[in-house]
C-alpha cells in the first residue's frame, strides 16, 4: 500500500522521463526553467528544454551512459548555468553557479521573484490567437506554460499542466465556433481568474513549508484533510498528510518532475483506497490523470460519521491525557486536531490550528503541574473566544459588504489597510485590498456553516501575498511582525492593527492626481484600479481624513471622470477640471 517506496534507479532522469512520458517531461522542465530564470526569452528556454530532453532520451536508451547517473539538480543547474547572459540579466543570481549542489539549487530558489519586472500580459485579438494556435499548436501551448511560470514562480507545476490542457481545449473548441470571441473570452477569463487563485493558494503552501517548516504544513494538512475526509481514520489521514507533504515539498523546492510523479502516485493510491477515505471520490477517480488530481484536490467534504463521541472524554476527562501526550506528543496532538477538524467543517483551518496550539500550550503547562487534571479541566473553555472572534468579524464584514457592494467594500478595506500600514507601496495595497474585498462576493453568499472556512482561509491566502511582496522590499515593521510571528495568527494580527500613529504623511504631489483621456478607454476593472490608487494616495497624504471626507472626494472624482469622458475635447477637460478637482480636494481634506 506504500506510495513512495521506489527502488533506487541508476539514472534519475531516465526514470522520470519513463514515468511521466515525453510530453509531460518537456512541459515540466520548461516550467522549472521559466520559474528559475524568469527574464530569459522563450526561445532560449525551449532550446535548453530540447537539449535536456535529448539527453534524457540517451539515458533511457542506456542508463549507464555518461552523466546519466547525475542528480536532476546537477543536470538542470548545469544547464541553467550555461546561459550566456546570466550576470547581465540576473546580477548576483549568477553567483549561484559557483556553488555546488545542494547549495546551488537553494541559491536559485532564494532568487525566485514573486513580483518580476515583466510587462503585463496583453490578450491579442481572438483571430490573431486562433491563427497562432493553428499555425503551431505546440509552440502556442509552450508559450502559455512559459508566460504563466515566469510570472508565478511557485505555481503548482502539475496543476499548471491541467490548466494548459484546459487552455488547449478552449482554443480547439472555440476557434471552430461561429462566434469565436463569445466562446473563447469567457473561458480565458475563467482560466485567468482560477490561475491567479491557484497560484496564490500554492504560494501559501510554499511559504508555510519554507518559513514555518514541515510541522506547520503537516498540521495544516491534518486539519484540512480531516475536514474533507471525516470518515477516514487517523492512520489514513496521517499517511495522506505524509505523502502530500512530500509532493508539496518537492514542488516548492523546484523538484517538479518528482513532484508531478509523486502526485500521480498519490492520486492513484487515493482512488485505489477510496472505500477507506471518502464516499465523494468516485467521480474524480473516473477521470484522466490531470483532471483526477485536480478533482481530488477540490473534492467536497464527505458527510461526518453519525454519533461521533464527545471529544472531552479522550482529551480532557481521561486520566491518561498526560501519559498519552508524553508518549508521542505530535501523534497525540495530531489525533486531537484530526478529531476536532472532522467534527468541525464549519471552522476555518487556521482556527482549528489555533485551538490545537492552545491545547498544546495548556498540556505543556499542566502536565508539569501538581494536579494536571485540575489544571487542564477547563481547556475547552479557552476555545470560546478564539471561535467567536472570526465569527464576529465575518458577520460584521459580510453586513458591510452587503450594504456597500464589492467595489465600495474594497474601498473601505483600502482605507482601513492604508491607515494600518501606510508605508507599504500603493500598488501592493491596491492589489491586496482588492483581493481582500473579493472575500465578500466569494464567501458572504454561503450559509453560516460554510462562511468561516471560506472567508478566513481565503484571507490567509491573500495576506500571504502581502507578506511575500513585502518581504522583497520590507518597509513596515508591523507587516514584518504580523507575517513572521505566527502563520495561523496572521489575520488576527492584521485585524488588531490600529491606525499607525508614527506615520509621517506623504508630501502632496499634484502629479499623482493628474488624469488623462486614456482613462476613458480603460476597462471597468482598470478604471476602478486607477480610482483606488488615487484613494490610497489620498489616505497616505491625509491619514486622519474621515470616511465622509474621503467619500466626498471620491464621489467628486467619479463625477469628474464621467464628465470628461463624455466631453468632446476630453484632454482639455481633464486638464482644466482636474486642476479644479485637486484644489477642491485639498480644501476638503485640509491639505
Amino acid at each position: 500500500r506504500g506510495v513512495f517506496r521506489r527502488d533506487a534507479h541508476k539514472s534519475e532522469v531516465a526514470h522520470r522521463f519513463k514515468d511521466l512520458g515525453e510530453e509531460n517531461f518537456k512541459a515540466l522542465v520548461l516550467i522549472a526553467f521559466a520559474q528559475y530564470l524568469q527574464q530569459c526569452p522563450f526561445e532560449d528556454h525551449v532550446k535548453l528544454v530540447n537539449e535536456v530532453t535529448e539527453f534524457a532520451k540517451t539515458c533511457v536508451a542506456d542508463e549507464s551512459a555518461e552523466n546519466c547517473d547525475k542528480s536532476l539538480h546537477t543536470l538542470f543547474g548545469d544547464k541553467l548555468c550555461t546561459v550566456a547572459t546570466l550576470r547581465e540579466t540576473y546580477g548576483e543570481m549568477a553567483d549561484c553557479c559557483a556553488k555546488q549542489e545542494p547549495e546551488r539549487n537553494e541559491c536559485f530558489l532564494q532568487h525566485k521573484d514573486d513580483n518580476p519586472n515583466l510587462p503585463r500580459l496583453v490578450r491579442p485579438e481572438v483571430d490573431v490567437m486562433c491563427t497562432a494556435f493553428h499555425d503551431n499548436e505546440e509552440t502556442f501551448l509552450k508559450k502559455y506554460l512559459y508566460e504563466i511560470a515566469r510570472r508565478h514562480p511557485y505555481f503548482y507545476a502539475p496543476e499548471l499542466l491541467f490548466f494548459a490542457k484546459r487552455y488547449k481545449a478552449a482554443f480547439t473548441e472555440c476557434c471552430q465556433a461561429a462566434d469565436k470571441a463569445a466562446c473563447l473570452l469567457p473561458k480565458l477569463d475563467e482560466l485567468r481568474d482560477e490561475g491567479k487563485a491557484s497560484s496564490a493558494k500554492q504560494r501559501l503552501k510554499c511559504a508555510s513549508l519554507q518559513k514555518f517548516g514541515e510541522r506547520a504544513f503537516k498540521a495544516w494538512a491534518v486539519a484540512r484533510l480531516s475536514q474533507r475526509f471525516p470518515k477516514a481514520e487517523f492512520a489514513e489521514v496521517s499517511k495522506l498528510v505524509t505523502d502530500l507533504t512530500k509532493v508539496h515539498t518537492e514542488c516548492c523546492h523546484g523538484d517538479l518532475l518528482e513532484c508531478a510523479d509523486d502526485r500521480a502516485d498519490l492520486a492513484k493510491y487515493i482512488c485505489e483506497n477510496q472505500d477507506s477515505i471518502s464516499s465523494k471520490l468516485k467521480e474524480c477517480c473516473e477521470k484522466p490523470l490531470l483532471e483526477k488530481s485536480h478533482c481530488i484536490a477540490e473534492v467536497e467534504n464527505d458527510e461526518m460519521p453519525a454519533d461521533l463521541p464527545s471529544l472531552a472524554a479522550d482529551f480532557v476527562e481521561s486520566k491518561d491525557v498526560c501519559k498519552n501526550y508524553a508518549e508521542a506528543k505530535d501523534v497525540f496532538l495530531g489525533m486531537f486536531l484530526y478529531e476536532y477538524a472532522r467534527r468541525h467543517p464549519d471552522y476555518s483551518v487556521v482556527l482549528l490550528l489555533r485551538l490545537a496550539k492552545t491545547y498544546e500550550t495548556t498540556l505543556e503547562k499542566c502536565c508539569a503541574a501538581a494536579d494536571p487534571h485540575e489544571c487542564y479541566a477547563k481547556v475547552f473553555d479557552e476555545f470560546k473566544p478564539l471561535v467567536e472572534e472570526p465569527q464576529n468579524l465575518i458577520k460584521q464584514n459580510c453586513e458591510l459588504f452587503e450594504q456597500l457592494g464589492e467595489y465600495k467594500f474594497q474601498n473601505a478595506l483600502l482605507v482601513r489597510y492604508t491607515k494600518k500600514v501606510p508605508q507599504v507601496s500603493t500598488p501592493t495595497l491596491v492589489e491586496v485590498s482588492r483581493n481582500l474585498g473579493k472575500v465578500g462576493s466569494k464567501c458572504c453568499k454561503h450559509p453560516e456553516a460554510k462562511r468561516m472556512p471560506c472567508a478566513e482561509d481565503y484571507l490567509s491566502v491573500v495576506l500571504n501575498q502581502l507578506c511575500v511582496l513585502h518581504e522583497k522590499t520590507p518597509v513596515s515593521d508591523r507587516v514584518t511582525k504580523c507575517c513572521t510571528e505566527s502563520l495561523v495568527n496572521r489575520r488576527p494580527c492584521f485585524s488588531a492593527l490600529e491606525v499607525d500613529e508614527t506615520y509621517v504623511p506623504k508630501e502632496f504631489n499634484a502629479e499623482t492626481f493628474t488624469f488623462h483621456a486614456d482613462i476613458c478607454t480603460l476597462s471597468e476593472k482598470e478604471r476602478q484600479i486607477k480610482k483606488q490608487t488615487a484613494l490610497v494616495e489620498l489616505v497616505k497624504h491625509k491619514p486622519k481624513a474621515t470616511k465622509e471626507q474621503l467619500k466626498a472626494v471620491m464621489d467628486d472624482f467619479a463625477a469628474f471622470v464621467e464628465k470628461c469622458c463624455k466631453a468632446d475635447d476630453k484632454e482639455t477637460c481633464f486638464a482644466e477640471e482636474g486642476k479644479k478637482l485637486v484644489a477642491a480636494s485639498q480644501a476638503a481634506l485640509g491639505l
Epitope: 481514520e233 496521517s238 505524509t242 498519552n324 508518549e327
Partner: nanobody, 118 residues
Framework: EVQLLESGGGLVQPGGSLRLSCTAS????????MGWVRQAPGKGLEWVSW????????YYADSVKGRFTISRDNSKNTLYLQMNSLRAEDTAVYYC???????????WGQGTLVTVSS
C-alpha cells in the same frame, strides 16, 4: 509503556484453523489502527490484515483474503485473527502491530509462531 501480547499460535495441519489474540496495554486502544504482520522463515515482514479503530473497515493481503478474519473488542483492548483453511505458506511468526499511520507501525509484540505442517 506500550505492550502487545500475542497468543494462540501453534502447530496445525493444512486446512485447519487457529485463532490468534493480542492483548494491548499502555495506550488508548480504541484510537489506533491495529493489524497483524507476519514474517515467514527467511522472508521480510508482510502486512496480513488491519482493522480501523472503530472496527468498520478491514484490509487483507491477497494471499489471505477469504480465509482470515480480523476483529477487535475495544472494551477488552483485544485484537483477534481467525485463520481458516491454513496452508503451508502461512507458516510464519505473527506479530500484532499498532499503527498511527497507514504505511507504518510504531509498536509490535514479541510474536507467536504458527506452523502449518502435516
Amino acid at each position: 509503556e506500550v505492550q502487545l501480547l500475542e497468543s494462540g499460535g501453534g502447530l496445525v495441519q493444512p486446512g485447519g484453523s487457529l485463532r490468534l489474540s493480542c492483548t494491548a496495554s499502555g495506550f488508548t486502544f480504541r484510537h489506533y489502527r491495529m493489524g497483524w504482520v507476519r514474517q515467514a522463515p527467511g522472508k521480510g515482514l508482510e502486512w496480513v490484515s488491519w482493522i480501523r479503530p472503530d472496527g468498520t473497515f478491514t484490509y487483507y493481503a491477497d494471499s489471505v483474503k477469504g480465509r482470515f478474519t480480523i476483529s477487535r473488542d475495544n472494551s477488552k483492548n483485544t485484537l483477534y485473527l481467525q485463520m481458516n483453511s491454513l496452508r503451508a505458506e502461512d507458516t510464519a511468526v505473527y506479530y500484532c502491530a499498532k499503527s498511527y499511520h497507514a504505511d507504518k507501525f510504531d509498536y509490535w509484540g514479541q510474536g507467536t509462531l504458527v506452523t502449518v505442517s502435516s
